[in-house]
């Protein structure tokens, strides 16, 4: 999987979009996970309502929340006040029985609020050396590595 | 148990090459990342590359670029480091150190490292 | 590459003691930080990682702070097997860069 950086600002929520196809994961539940390094275990955050034809309702676990259209074949998260440790590499998941298909590879990225001048020197600004090499702008707060890219292993 | 036992000390002169070995038990290397990290006597940490023993990709820091070589063995579950052109400097403590990558890793593992004197 | 640069290079303290150490990058490093502790002879030993997370097995007298360029190891209360040199390595890029070490010596 390619893996698609979503870049967020401190203090405001930040959506992450999932696209899959919805006849291929027709009736599966979702989940949204954080990964423990690139190829460490996926730890859940929170997944969909466990009734398939209830996923399009909003559950929170903290301050993320998941919600699925599974007729679009769109699974939203949304990690509402932003914080650095937020930021990390997470897995949206089409889950059967144990065993879980990944739907995308996501990294998120915390931006310094513009704003916060108190805080400015706490957070990364865009600009700075990024964490994968090379890669495209998707759209204003999402972007993929290119095909066949490799992200560096991160450090601990 | 989980360990990296690596290679014995070795002391080479001036010019000459060194292969340093790293073999992993209790764990594949192909779920990790291995890292090589230099301290040469009373001297700080000083991280060399790293290997995916899983597809073989690896990097190195500009300063050991061209001259060293991360290599891995996952049959015997052992990664390799060598290093050419040996100069007095290259003197140091060499430890491997495997972990899950980047963005939180929670495994750290190290070898007990190996010795390499650089003498004429 | 991305300097880092630790403070105080050492430091004599008493067991008991609420001991500091900072280490500041020169690049924007979000929370991709960890610290390690070194004793004379050993490989380093990972405390904490992601800037504030403590390590599976280390002691809660240990914490970690900060994030962006300002980083901070705090030992609550300093401990004899505590008596070592502590590392800050950044993992935001490649190629990973430690700090030159703070030794904690026995005051």
């Known amino acids: 999987h390619n893996t698609t950086v979503f870049q967020g600002v401190a203090g405001q929520s930040l959506q992450v979009s999932c696209p899959y196809d919805s006849m291929k994961h027709w009736g599966r539940r979702k989940a949204w996970c954080r990964q423990l390094g690139e190829k460490g275990p996926c730890q859940r955050v929170v997944s969909t309502h466990n009734l398939w034809l209830l996923s399009f309702l909003r559950r929170w676990n903290g301050s993320t929340a998941i919600t699925d259209d599974t007729l679009g074949g769109t699974l939203t998260i949304t990690l509402r006040n932003l914080q650095p440790h937020d930021a990390g590499l997470y897995q949206c998941q089409s889950l059967h029985g144990s065993e879980a298909d990944t739907l995308r590879k996501v990294l998120v990225e915390v931006l310094a609020d513009p704003l916060d001048h108190r805080d400015a020197g706490d957070l990364w600004f865009p600009g700075e050396s990024e964490s994968f090499e090379d890669a495209h702008v998707e759209h204003s707060i999402s972007r993929s590595l290119l095909e066949g890219e490799i992200p560096f292993p991160p450090t601990s | 148990q989980v360990q990296l036992v690596q290679s014995g000390a070795e002391v080479k002169k001036p010019g000459a090459s060194v292969k340093v070995s790293c073999k992993a038990s209790?764990?594949?290397?192909?779920?990790?990342?291995i890292h090589w990290v230099r301290q040469a006597p009373g001297q700080g940490l000083e991280w060399m590359g790293w290997?995916?023993?899983?597809?073989?990709?690896?990097k190195y820091a500009p300063k050991f670029q061209g001259r060293a070589t991360i290599t891995a063995d996952t049959s015997t579950s052992t990664a390799y480091m060598e290093l050419s052109s040996l100069r007095s400097e290259d003197t140091a403590v060499y430890y491997c150190?495997?972990?899950?990558?980047?963005?939180?890793?929670?495994?750290?593992?190290w070898g007990q490292g190996t010795l390499v004197t650089v003498s004429s | 590459d991305i300097q880092m640069t630790q403070s105080p290079s050492s430091l004599s303290a008493s067991v008991g003691d609420r001991v500091t150490i900072t280490c500041h990058a020169s690049q924007h490093i979000n929370v991709w930080l960890s610290w390690y502790q070194q004793k004379p002879g050993k490989a380093p030993k990972l405390l904490i990682y992601?800037?504030?997370n403590l390590h599976t097995g280390v002691p809660s007298r240990f914490s970690g702070s900060g994030s962006g360029t300002d980083f901070t190891l705090t030992i609550s209360s300093l401990q004899p097997e505590d008596f070592a040199t502590y590392y800050c390595q950044q993992g935001q890029t490649y190629p990973r860069t430690f700090g030159q070490g703070t030794k904690v010596e026995i005051k």
């Open positions: 290997i995916d023993p899983e597809n073989g990709d690896s």
């Open positions: 209790g764990f594949s290397i192909e779920d990790f990342y």
């Open positions: 150190h495997a972990d899950h990558g980047n963005y939180g890793s929670t495994m750290d593992y």
């Open positions: 992601k800037a504030s």
